[in-house]
């Protein structure tokens, strides 16, 4: 079944989306499943349907139950079910598990807590945020769009975070709150824009015609485990595997983790039997991660034979 659990608090707004997707042009009919009674679309009603959305403005405990939505297109009907539970407001600060949205985890470098379900509502910034029922104050906390950013996250920042906002419907305001747990990962690692250690930008590498030559592309990406980190060589702006010169191959070197903990990668470009035409190519060392891409260019030059005159 296409079924979705939704919950809210009495006297707050609750908006539920039909679990079945459809084009905006499709008609969506809503019914209260127990009685098969159609939900009205007139906005003067406290509970009304608005396309894919079912709106409780505000919700009451008696609204709890299963609601059926039918998405109607010219060629098919799709049925979904919304299992709605409205709870009485707690007198104490404790938020019970059944009112909690999914737990999110953060670290020193990534500490965004998104306000659950907010995308369904017509709200305006700023959001109010509370931790364990206390309003968040201080420069470490920044309410930004639909999420909270915590600077310099510490293990003590773990806890239950509640966002509170106002939904506006035809000039009437309704309060909405949503709570989720935040856990802090003890993560010493971090990621930064790739730093290419070798070759230097616009380096000229001397090679001997007829001999083999190696170029090493070495880059560091941060500390600890990296989500995405890669180094590669390109020839005249084309990937080695697409360039089609079997004499020139790249070979992954050692994954390096230096004593300072930096995560680095090597890629060795091996040129067998260097030819004159190799001197005309542009060799690009590329380092890529989720921050972006950095490129260093190398050119080859002929090594002059050593003069052995005494």
């Amino acid at each position: 079944k296409f079924s979705k659990q939704s919950w809210g608090l009495e006297n707050e707004a609750l908006i539920v989306r039909c679990p079945r997707q459809g084009k905006p042009s499709y008609t969506v009919d809503w019914y209260y499943s127990q009685t098969n009674k159609s939900i009205p679309t007139q906005e003067r009603n406290r509970v009304f349907a608005s396309g894919q959305l079912l709106k409780f403005l505000p919700a009451a405990v008696a609204d709890s139950g299963i609601y059926t939505c039918i998405v109607r297109s010219p060629t098919f009907n799709r049925t979904g079910y919304a299992n709605v539970t409205i709870y009485k407001k707690q007198s104490d600060c404790n938020v019970p598990d059944y009112l909690m949205y999914s737990t999110v985890s953060g670290s020193e470098k990534n500490s965004k807590i998104y306000c659950p379900t907010i995308d369904l509502y017509n709200w305006t910034a700023p959001l109010e945020w509370f931790k364990n029922c206390q309003a968040l104050q201080g420069s470490r906390y920044r309410a930004h769009k639909s999420f909270l950013v915590i600077d310099n996250v510490m293990t003590e920042d773990a806890g239950d975070y509640t966002c509170k906002f106002i939904h506006n419907e035809n000039g009437a305001n309704y309060s909405v709150t949503a709570t989720r747990s935040f856990t802090v990962k003890d993560e010493q690692g971090f990621s930064l824009f790739p730093v290419i250690g070798a070759p230097a930008q616009n380096e000229i590498k001397e090679v001997e015609i007829g001999k083999n030559a190696n170029l090493t592309c070495s880059a560091c990406f941060g500390k600890g485990t990296q989500f995405l980190a890669a180094v590669l060589w390109q020839l005249n702006g084309t990937k080695i595997t697409d360039f089609g010169e079997p004499r020139i191959q790249q070979e992954e070197g050692q994954n390096q983790s230096f004593s300072n903990g930096l995560a680095c990668l090597d890629m060795v470009l091996r040129i067998a039997d260097v030819k004159e035409e190799d001197l005309l190519l542009q060799y690009d060392c590329l380092a890529l991660n989720l921050h972006g891409l950095r490129r260093h260019t190398v050119r080859l030059s002929r090594k002059n034979p050593i003069d052995h005159h005494s």
Partner: nanobody, 121 residues
Framework: EVQLVESGGGLVQPGGSLRLSCAAS????????MGWFRQAPGKEREFVAV???????KYADSVKGRFTISADNSKNTAYLQMNSLKPEDTAVYYC???????????????WGQGTLVTVSS
């Protein structure tokens, strides 16, 4: 700038498969690193997979063994084969391309408009 157009999204049951395509305009495809990212409702855009060249691919831990990224140079197209789909794979999937300049920040990657993948029974 590379223009990217994704296709292949849709509704699929858990355990099912989908194949996303990303067609790239222009002749920069051979110098471009192609990737797929996704954004679930209320969450940040996250990395899914990248194809560095025909022999080198990288995947997010959450999709390893289930998703396969590939590219067809002759068609200037990248693909994401998604198998054993789970409800948590539901998201808008974006194709991305990076190449060209000496330094390119993540915000300067070229992005497609996205294609919605819904995994639900």
């Amino acid at each position: 700038e590379v223009q990217l157009v994704e296709s292949g999204g849709g509704l699929v049951q858990p355990g099912g498969s989908l194949r996303l395509s990303c067609a790239a305009s222009g002749n920069a495809f051979r110098s471009t690193v192609m990737g797929w990212f996704r954004q679930a409702p209320g969450k940040e855009r996250e990395f899914v997979a990248v194809i560095i060249d025909s022999r080198t691919t990288k995947y997010a831990d959450s999709v390893k063994g289930r998703f396969t990224i590939s590219a067809d140079n002759s068609k200037n197209t990248a693909y994401l084969q998604m198998n054993s789909l789970k409800p948590e794979d539901t998201a808008v999937y974006y194709c991305a391309a990076v190449g060209g300049a000496t330094t390119v920040t993540a915000s300067e990657w070229d992005w497609g408009q996205g294609t919605l993948v819904t995994v639900s029974s």
